[in-house]
Amino acid sequence: AGTPEVWVQVQMEATELSSFTVHCGFLGPGSISLVTVSWGGPDGAGGTKLAVLHPELGTRQWAPARQARWETQSSISLALEDSGASSPFANTTFCCKFASFPEGSWESCGSLPPSSDPGLSAPPTPVPILRADLAGILGLSGVLLFGCGYLLHLLRRQKHRPTPRLQPSHTNSQALTAQAWAPSQASQAALHDPYATINTSFCPATLDTAHPNGWASLPTHAAHQPQGPAASASTPILARGSFVSVENGLYTQAGERPPHTGPGLTLFPDCRGPRALEGRFGVR
């Protein structure tokens, strides 16, 4: 099975220039238990929730969200009403976090292309997940200067080096409006839509014993680094931008009991510990 991928696409409606739609999708074998859409940054890291969608319980949305809905079993859309004359959505980052079992929680962000023609956005394209133990980021200026041939050359050369671990960088809160090459089982070296997505974080799902009241028993040991899905030992990401959020490990706290996601299954949709309880609130 390939590494899960999340894509995000923001487009302006051709008919109403004050209306925007965020489209998000999850490419992975697991079942989705929750989707959280936020703006201004990732959920819980400066972002503000716009909508939460549960595949069965429903959806919940807050202004300026107008309508959140499932487009398929693994993709959602969120229509936004921009009441301001200056169109603040144009420069805003939108993030989608998919909690799934057994992959865990995966979050990607995107923003409206700087010079997008209304209604002419490219179709959503899968964007590779940034895995902390698999991905490396090369120099920012290099991406701008070198062509595809050199990118391929770098990719080939990278395979013979140890991959550097990603560290969160906070020099720029904007999205990675990245032209990225990142082969994986799910998308073999495809050139992705430069505005489709950015920052992606991962946290693992855990299978545990569900109690009759719908909450699971949580391990009390310290956070660990679980093994993720098998993937190539080297998946370099070549990107323009500097905001990368990487969250690996499961952080638990006494009293936190995520809601169940099915008979005998418990998903920890968020590994931030105190925020692990986003679970059940839905959007209508």
């Epitope: 595949p55 069965e56 919940r60 719908g214 936190e256 986003e278 059940r280 209508r284």
Partner: antibody, heavy 114, light 113 residues
Framework: EVQLVQSGAEVKKPGSSVKVSCKAS????????IEWVRQAPGQGLEWMGE????????NYNEKFKGRVTFTADESTSTAYMELSSLRSEDTAVYYC???????WGQGTLVTVSS | DIVMTQSPDSLAVSLGERATINCKSS????????????LAWYQQKPGQPPKLLIY???TRESGVPDRFSGSGSGTDFTLTISSLQAEDVAVYYC?????????FGQGTKLEIK
């Protein structure tokens, strides 16, 4: 286990206001939405609206807009529902709830009588 | 707003017998995108808050006995109690979880015959 504990019963005069509290425990207060639902004696359930404590984002049932205000205090993990311009037909049990109505407070009886 | 209408208003069933409650919505609660129905069922006993029984039209909430089942799609839904127990005496509500505002049915009072 998420628990929602509401304030005690209230008796109010018509035209006055009432503020009901709902204290949450066992979860991360700012991460889940608090709903308010009321039930008049012998009647059904009526959704009044909701607040997301983390951002104080709200949704109101049109029927109550202008008369109801939702607030939340993250420092005490408490949500509040204030209903103004009370009339006799507002006599009801007021519930707070969360997680798509999976968890409920015990209810607060508000009696409006002159 | 979506109007939820339950039938019957009250129902008397013998212990061990099957109880069936119907719920009709004024608009479809089926999301065509993921083919899920956004309808929930609640049980409310006297002096208590409601309790979530079923969501997604047919998914039982954790801890709910398997004698409770939900079915239906679109605008017509059914809650079935396969073998009525004394503790099932309560008022049952269906709820639109599809769109704002969430609306509830008027309730069905279930009693023992």
């Amino acid at each position: 286990e998420v628990q929602l504990v509401q304030s005690g019963a209230e008796v109010k005069k018509p035209g006055s206001s009432v503020k009901v509290s709902c204290k949450a425990s066992g979860g991360t207060f700012s991460s889940f939405s608090i709903e308010w639902v009321r039930q008049a004696p012998g009647q059904g359930l009526e959704w009044m609206g909701e607040i997301l404590p983390g951002s104080n984002s709200t949704n109101y049932n049109e029927k109550f807009k202008g008369r109801v205000t939702f607030t939340a205090d993250e420092s005490t993990s408490t949500a509040y529902m204030e209903l103004s311009s009370l009339r006799s037909e507002d006599t009801a049990v007021y519930y707070c709830s969360s997680y798509w109505f999976a968890y409920w407070g015990q209810g607060t009886l508000v009696t409006v009588s002159s | 707003d979506i109007v939820m209408t339950q039938s019957p208003d009250s129902l008397a069933v013998s212990l061990g017998e099957r109880a069936t409650i119907n719920c009709k919505s004024s608009q479809s609660l089926l999301n065509s995108g993921n083919q899920k129905n956004y309808l929930a069922w609640y049980q409310q006993k006297p002096g208590q808050p409601p309790k979530l029984l079923i969501y997604g039209a047919s998914t039982r909430e954790s801890g709910v006995p398997d004698r409770f089942s939900g079915s239906g799609s679109g605008t017509d839904f059914t809650l079935t109690i396969s073998s009525l127990q004394a503790e099932d005496v309560a008022v049952y509500y269906c709820q639109n979880a599809h769109s704002y505002p969430p609306t509830f049915g008027q309730g069905t009072k279930l009693e023992i015959k």
